[in-house]
Interface confidence: low
């Protein structure tokens, strides 16, 4: 009885930003949840939570620093990531749980997605031109 | 082939107690959460007692919290239901469900075992 | 809790009839609503799973409609087999709930 993940195997964040969507086996709607995403192979970092009740207001939070938002549909979540650095290029596990109603369940662990952070291509500045052009 | 057959069931008096089993057979029984549903003689279902794979997760219908306790035995392939401070009104056919993949859809049911509370 | 009312209590109809049954909830349960059919002497069966979803090996003769509090479940044509009582129950509220149920009984 373990809820299935389907994620996209990689992702490009070209302006420092991404869309990671969660797909699941499990229809969200009127249910008390938790989404989580994670970082890592380890899944050792929890990049941000999405936190759902029927009846309260989503919440999203993210208590390691990570600038994030989310997004609810029936069957998943979708976490936006804003000023990501090129060194979080890394492997995203996404994670649900539901709480209520009983009985409790939770994830098969995913394949997860690998984000690939490009940095913002920032203009040269006139006084240090980049190389010419034959 | 997947089996369920419960057993256990009889006559008690009033405040009596009773212990339900139901033995599992064709399916890999420690990966379903699996549930108690009772139906009193020529009365409708009523869902009593629910209880997750790994044992970690119990639940109960008000009609018999604190009364009844759920439990399994995962290497025996096993569910069971003590019934205690037993009452006239607990007098029905049991019935041991899988939950299937979908949560709280009951498939298959065991034959039920009746219960009877009577002085 | 949600209650669950089925209509009518008995429905009186001939082998190769047209059977519909319907289960009213008392607040909405989404899609959230299965039927099983429990012959005499027997066991309940699964046959409809969120609302319109048939379990595996049930007959094409079996459909269900409807969401939030409105709820039917239609049998083609009847066979003789399919006289027994259907029972509706939903999962979209804690705890789960079933219906008193609908005799399909034999004119």
């Known amino acids: 009885n373990k809820i299935l993940v389907k994620q996209s195997p990689m992702l490009v964040a070209y302006d420092n930003a991404v869309n990671l969507s969660c797909k699941y086996s499990y229809n969200l709607f009127s249910r008390e949840f938790r989404a989580s995403l994670h970082k890592g192979l380890d899944s050792a970092v929890e990049v941000c939570v999405v936190y759902g009740n029927y009846s309260q207001q989503l919440q999203v939070y993210s208590k390691t620093g990570f600038n994030c938002d989310g997004k609810l549909g029936n069957e998943s979540v979708t976490f936006y990531l804003q000023n990501l650095y090129v060194n979080q290029t890394d492997i995203y596990f996404c994670k649900i749980e539901v709480m209520y109603p009983p009985p409790y369940l939770d994830n098969e662990k995913s394949n997860g997605t690998i984000i690939h952070v490009k940095g913002k291509h920032l203009c040269p500045s006139p006084l240090f031109p980049g190389p010419s052009k034959p | 082939e997947v089996q369920l057959v419960e057993s256990g069931g009889g006559l008690v008096k009033p405040g009596g107690s009773l212990r339900l089993s139901c033995a599992a057979s064709g399916f890999t029984f420690s990966s379903y959460t699996m549930n108690w549903v009772r139906q009193a003689p020529g009365k409708g279902l009523e869902w009593v007692s629910s209880?997750?794979?790994?044992?970690?997760?119990?639940y109960y219908s008000d009609s018999v919290k604190g009364r009844f306790t759920i439990s399994r035995d995962n290497a025996k392939n096993s569910l069971y239901l003590q019934m205690n401070s037993l009452r006239a009104e607990d007098t029905a056919e049991y019935y041991c469900?899988?939950?299937?993949?979908?949560?709280?859809?009951?498939?298959?049911w065991g034959q039920g075992t009746l219960v009877t509370v009577s002085s | 809790e949600i209650v669950l009312t089925q209509s009518p209590a008995t429905l009186s109809l001939s082998p190769g009839e047209r059977a519909t049954l319907s289960c009213r909830a008392s607040?909405?349960?989404?899609?959230?609503l299965a039927w099983y059919q429990q012959n005499p002497g027997q066991v309940p069966r699964l046959l409809i799973y969120d609302a319109s979803n048939r379990a595996t090996g049930i007959p094409v003769r079996f459909s269900g409609s409807g969401s939030g509090t409105d709820f039917t479940l239609t049998i083609s044509s009847l066979e003789p087999e399919d006289f027994a009582v259907y029972y509706c129950?939903?999962?979209?509220?804690?705890?789960?709930?079933f219906g008193q149920g609908t005799k399909v009984e034999i004119k």
């Open positions: 209880i997750s794979s790994s044992s970690s997760h119990k």
């Open positions: 469900a899988r939950e299937g993949d979908i949560v709280l859809i009951f498939d298959p």
């Open positions: 607040q909405s349960v989404s899609s959230y």
């Open positions: 129950q939903q999962r979209g509220n804690w705890p789960p709930t």
